[in-house]
C-alpha cells in the first residue's frame, strides 16, 4: 500500500482485460463540512448493462460494516439507495460510468478512518471487485462558530434566548448578561453531531446577552440585545 502516493490503483488479472479501482490515498476535511470520497473503476465486462450494486464500507475491506449501498436495475443509471448510515452518505458518481464516488455530509471526528468502495455485477456477468487499500478520510477538528443567536417570545410575556454553535469537539456554551453576577443559567442540549444549542429560558432584564462557545481550538462570541417598552401593551425587542 503506497500510502504516500496521491492515488492507489488496484487491479487483478482477468482473461484479456482487468478489474481495477482508483481511489486517492487520503481525503482531508474539517468537521461539520462535507467530503467527497472518489472511487472509479474499470472492469472486463464490456457493455455490461445488467443489475449492479455499489457498496461503501468502513474499517476494513470485505468485512467492515457497510455505510452505503445502492442498487441499479438493468439498463438504469439511477442507483437506488438501500442504505445510508445516519442519512449522511450519498452517491455522487454514476456506477454505469464506472464512478462510485461518495459524498459524506456533516462530518464528525468519529468519521475519520478508512473507507472501501465495492461494485457488484449481479446479472449474467456475475462478478465483483473491492478496493483493498481504500481511501483514508481524515476529519480535522474545527474551532467554534456561532451559527444562530436569537431572542424568542416565551410564556407569560417573557422572552428566551437561543444560541446554536458548531465545532469539533462540540463546544461548551455559556450565556452572560445584565443579570446580577453578569451570568445566567443556561439549558444546554446536544444538537446534531457537531452542533450544540443552549437556551436562556427567561430574560429578566433589558440589555446585552452574550453567548460564548469554546472548545480546545478556540472560542467565539455573539450578542443579542433586549429592549422592552415598559407599560406598552405590545412588548418588542
Amino acid at each position: 500500500d503506497a500510502s504516500g502516493d496521491l492515488l492507489n490503483t488496484e487491479a487483478h488479472s482477468a482473461p484479456a482485460q482487468r478489474w481495477s479501482m482508483q481511489v486517492p490515498a487520503e481525503v482531508n476535511a474539517e468537521a461539520g463540512d462535507a467530503a467527497v470520497l472518489p472511487c472509479t473503476f474499470t472492469h472486463p465486462h464490456r457493455h455490461y448493462d445488467g443489475p449492479l450494486t455499489a457498496i461503501w464500507r468502513s474499517g476494513e475491506p470485505y468485512a467492515g460494516p457497510q455505510v452505503f449501498r445502492c442498487t441499479a436495475a438493468p439498463g438504469s443509471e439511477l442507483c437506488q439507495t438501500a442504505l445510508s448510515l445516519h442519512g449522511r452518505f450519498r452517491l455522487l458518481g454514476n456506477p454505469r460510468r464506472n464512478d462510485l464516488s461518495l459524498r459524506v455530509e456533516r462530518l464528525a471526528l468519529a468519521d475519520s478512518g478508512r473507507y472501501f468502495c465495492r461494485v457488484e455485477f449481479t446479472g449474467d456477468a456475475h462478478d465483483r471487485y473491492e478496493s483493498r487499500h481504500g481511501v483514508r478520510l481524515r476529519v480535522t477538528a474545527a474551532a467554534p462558530r456561532i451559527v444562530n443567536i436569537s431572542v424568542l417570545p416565551g410564556p407569560a410575556h417573557a422572552f428566551r434566548a437561543l444560541c446554536t454553535a458548531e465545532g469539533e469537539p462540540p463546544p461548551a456554551l455559556a450565556w452572560s448578561g445584565p443579570a446580577p453576577g453578569n451570568s445566567s443559567a443556561a439549558l444546554q442540549g446536544q444538537g446534531h453531531g457537531y452542533q450544540v444549542t443552549a437556551e436562556l429560558p427567561a430574560l429578566t432584564r433589558d440589555g446585552r446577552y452574550t453567548c460564548t462557545a469554546a472548545n480546545s481550538l478556540g472560542r467565539a462570541e455573539a450578542s443579542v440585545y433586549l429592549f422592552r417598552f415598559h407599560g406598552a401593551p405590545g412588548t418588542s425587542t
Epitope: 487483478h12 488479472s13 482477468a14 482473461p15 450494486t53 457498496i55 464500507r57 475491506p61 470485505y62 468485512a63 467492515g64 457497510q66 449501498r69 442504505l83 465495492r118 457488484e120 449481479t122 456475475h126 465483483r128
Partner: antibody
Framework: EVQLLESGGGLVQPGGSLRLSCAAS????????MSWVRQAPGKGLEWVST????????YYADSVKGRFTISRDNSKNTLYLQMNSLRAEDTAVYYC???????????????WGQGTMVTVSS | DIQMTQSPSSVSASVGDRVTITCRAS??????LAWYQQKPGKAPKLLIY???YIHSGVPSRFSGSGSGTDFTLTISSLQPEDFATYYC?????????FGQGTKLEIK
C-alpha cells in the same frame, strides 16, 4: 449475541420432505446473503444453496436443483430450506452460514450455525 | 465447476511446528479463497478470507497467501488447539466448492 440456530432436522424416508429453519440474531439479517452447506457423515463440506439478502436471487448445487428450495423471511430473521424428494445421499449435517460483508455475494462464510442432522433412510 | 484440491490430505506435526497446507484451483479464482478450521462434531470456523485476510479473533499465527490458482495456509507455530481438519473454499463463482480437507494430527 451474533448467532445462527438451525432446526427441523430428523429422520425421513426416501422420497419424503423436510423443512429446515435457521434463526438469526445479533446482526442485520437482510443485509447479508445466506447459504446452506452440508456435510455427510465422515465426509467433507458441500455447498448446497445461497439466497441474496433481499431474496432477489437463489442459487443451487446441481445435486439438489429442482428438489430443494431456499427462502428467507427478513421480518422474522429466518432462513429456510425446503427439501423434497429426499434421497439417501442427502443424509448429512446441514449448516446455515452467513456471508461476510455482502448482501449478494458470499466472499466467505463468517458465521455458522451448530448444524442439524438430516437422515434419509427406510 | 471449479475443483479445489488440497494437499496433503493429512499431516502429522508437533506443538511448535510450522505447518503449511496448500490448495489448488482448477482455474484462476483471483483471490476469492477462504480457509476454515473444523473440529469433530463442531461447525467450521472461518480463518482466512479473500486469500490473505485474517478473520477477527483468529490468532496471528495463521496466515494465508496466494492468488490465481495456488494458495497456502500457514500455521507458524502449532498450538494444541490447532489440531483439526482444514478446508479451503473458492467463492469466485457458483457453485461454491470446497477442498476435500486436510486433517492435522498430533505426531
Amino acid at each position: 449475541e451474533v448467532q445462527l440456530l438451525e432446526s427441523g432436522g430428523g429422520l425421513v424416508q426416501p422420497g419424503g420432505s423436510l423443512r429446515l429453519s435457521c434463526a438469526a440474531s445479533g446482526f442485520t439479517f437482510s443485509s447479508y446473503a445466506m447459504s446452506w452447506v452440508r456435510q455427510a457423515p465422515g465426509k467433507g463440506l458441500e455447498w448446497v444453496s445461497t439466497i441474496t439478502g433481499g431474496g432477489e436471487s437463489t442459487y443451487y448445487a446441481d445435486s439438489v436443483k429442482g428438489r430443494f428450495t431456499i427462502s428467507r423471511d427478513n421480518s422474522k430473521n429466518t432462513l429456510y430450506l425446503q427439501m423434497n424428494s429426499l434421497r439417501a445421499e442427502d443424509t448429512a449435517v446441514y449448516y446455515c452460514a452467513k456471508a461476510i460483508g455482502s448482501s449478494w455475494y458470499s466472499d466467505a462464510f463468517d458465521l455458522w450455525g451448530q448444524g442439524t442432522m438430516v437422515t434419509v433412510s427406510s | 465447476d471449479i475443483q479445489m484440491t488440497q494437499s496433503p490430505s493429512s499431516v502429522s506435526a508437533s506443538v511448535g511446528d510450522r505447518v503449511t497446507i496448500t490448495c489448488r484451483a482448477s482455474q484462476d479464482i483471483s483471490s476469492w479463497l477462504a480457509w476454515y478450521q473444523q473440529k469433530p462434531g463442531k461447525a467450521p470456523k472461518l480463518l482466512i478470507y479473500v486469500a490473505s485476510y485474517i478473520h477477527s479473533g483468529v490468532p496471528s499465527r495463521f496466515s494465508g497467501s496466494g492468488s490465481g490458482t495456488d494458495f497456502t495456509l500457514t500455521i507458524s507455530s502449532l498450538q494444541p488447539e490447532d489440531f483439526a481438519t482444514y478446508y479451503c473454499q473458492q467463492s469466485y463463482s457458483i457453485p461454491y466448492t470446497f477442498g476435500q480437507g486436510t486433517k492435522l494430527e498430533i505426531k
